[in-house]
């Protein structure tokens, strides 16, 4: 009875279990009866990083130096390349696909410390009594207006990403 | 295409005075928070000042604190900086650069040598 699994390292196809292609290696053909799965290693600056039953290998990484990028860590016939960023410069990602100078702080997010050579910018929330409402790399969270000392009331709460909206005091006739 | 061109730096004597500008197209220069970074021989980058988009805050590095006024025409698309009591140490090149400060959105630079 041909059979519904197969075990680790294994694919089925054709009703026959055949073994997959190890890391750095594409599968040519599927095993047969009479063969076994045929494998070749992948080409330079090629990947496979899985058992697997690919046709074709991944493209290495490409670390462009336009993008501020360089490697980090050469790619193998099993590994992808690792790219970073030149010098006093910082990934904008975990995958590290371009480089910043420096991030900035979004809106509802202040600036706790600015950039050096050697750290990125540190971004903190804003707390209660103060907001953030542009994407900077410098400006701390401001404090909300206050109403009172304008002698204006609250006509609208302030947020973390706006400030409060000054109106008028009703006055009694 | 985001292009930002550098000018005015020159060769000039400890306490002189040198005016940068900043010449900006290929984006709306008013909506962006822009930098001034400068480069020493053999150094990395250094922050040296920022101001945000209508003109009104401004950042400026320790090293260059009382020294250097950053400015903005938004209607020229052009960012400033006044540099007066210049130091030695203030030789570097001299870039503008806007948020979000990718690699690409770099000018040539301006030299700056500061020397008697």
């Known amino acids: 009875e041909p059979p519904t699994a197969c075990r680790e390292k294994q694919y089925l196809i054709n009703s026959q279990c055949c073994s997959l292609c190890q890391p750095g290696q594409k599968l040519v053909s599927d095993c047969t009866e009479f063969t076994e799965t045929e494998c070749l290693p992948c080409g330079e600056s090629e990947f496979l990083d899985t058992w697997n039953r690919e046709t074709h290998c991944h493209q290495h990484k490409y670390c462009d130096p336009n993008l501020g990028l360089r490697v980090q860590q050469k790619g193998t016939s099993e590994t992808d390349t690792i790219c970073t960023c030149e010098e006093g410069w910082h990934c904008t990602s975990e995958a590290c696909e371009s480089c910043v100078l420096h991030r900035s702080c979004s809106p509802g997010f202040g600036v706790k410390q600015i950039a050096t050579g050697v750290s990125d910018t540190i971004c903190e929330p804003c707390p209660v009594g103060f907001f953030s409402n542009v994407s900077s790399a410098f400006e701390k969270c401001h404090p909300w207006t206050s109403c009172e000392t304008k002698d204006l009331v609250v006509q609208q709460a302030g947020t973390n990403k706006t400030d409060v909206v000054c109106g008028p005091q009703d006055r009694l006739r | 295409e985001v292009q930002l061109l550098e000018s005015g730096g020159g060769l000039v004597q400890p306490g002189g005075s040198l005016r940068l500008s900043c010449a900006a197209s290929?984006?709306?220069?008013?909506?962006?928070e822009m930098w001034w970074v400068r480069q020493a021989p053999g150094k990395g980058l250094e922050r040296v000042s920022?101001?945000?988009?209508?003109?009104?805050?401004?950042y400026y590095a320790d090293s260059v604190k009382g020294r250097f006024t950053i400015s903005r025409d938004n209607s020229k698309n052009t960012l400033y900086l006044q540099m007066n009591s210049l130091r030695a140490e203030d030789t570097a090149v001299y870039y503008c650069?806007?948020?979000?400060?990718?690699?690409?959105?770099w000018g040539q630079g301006t030299l700056v040598t500061v020397s008697s």
């Open positions: 290929g984006f709306t220069f008013r909506d962006y």
């Open positions: 650069t806007k948020l979000p400060f990718t690699f690409e959105d």
């Open positions: 920022a101001i945000n988009p209508q003109g009104t805050r401004t």
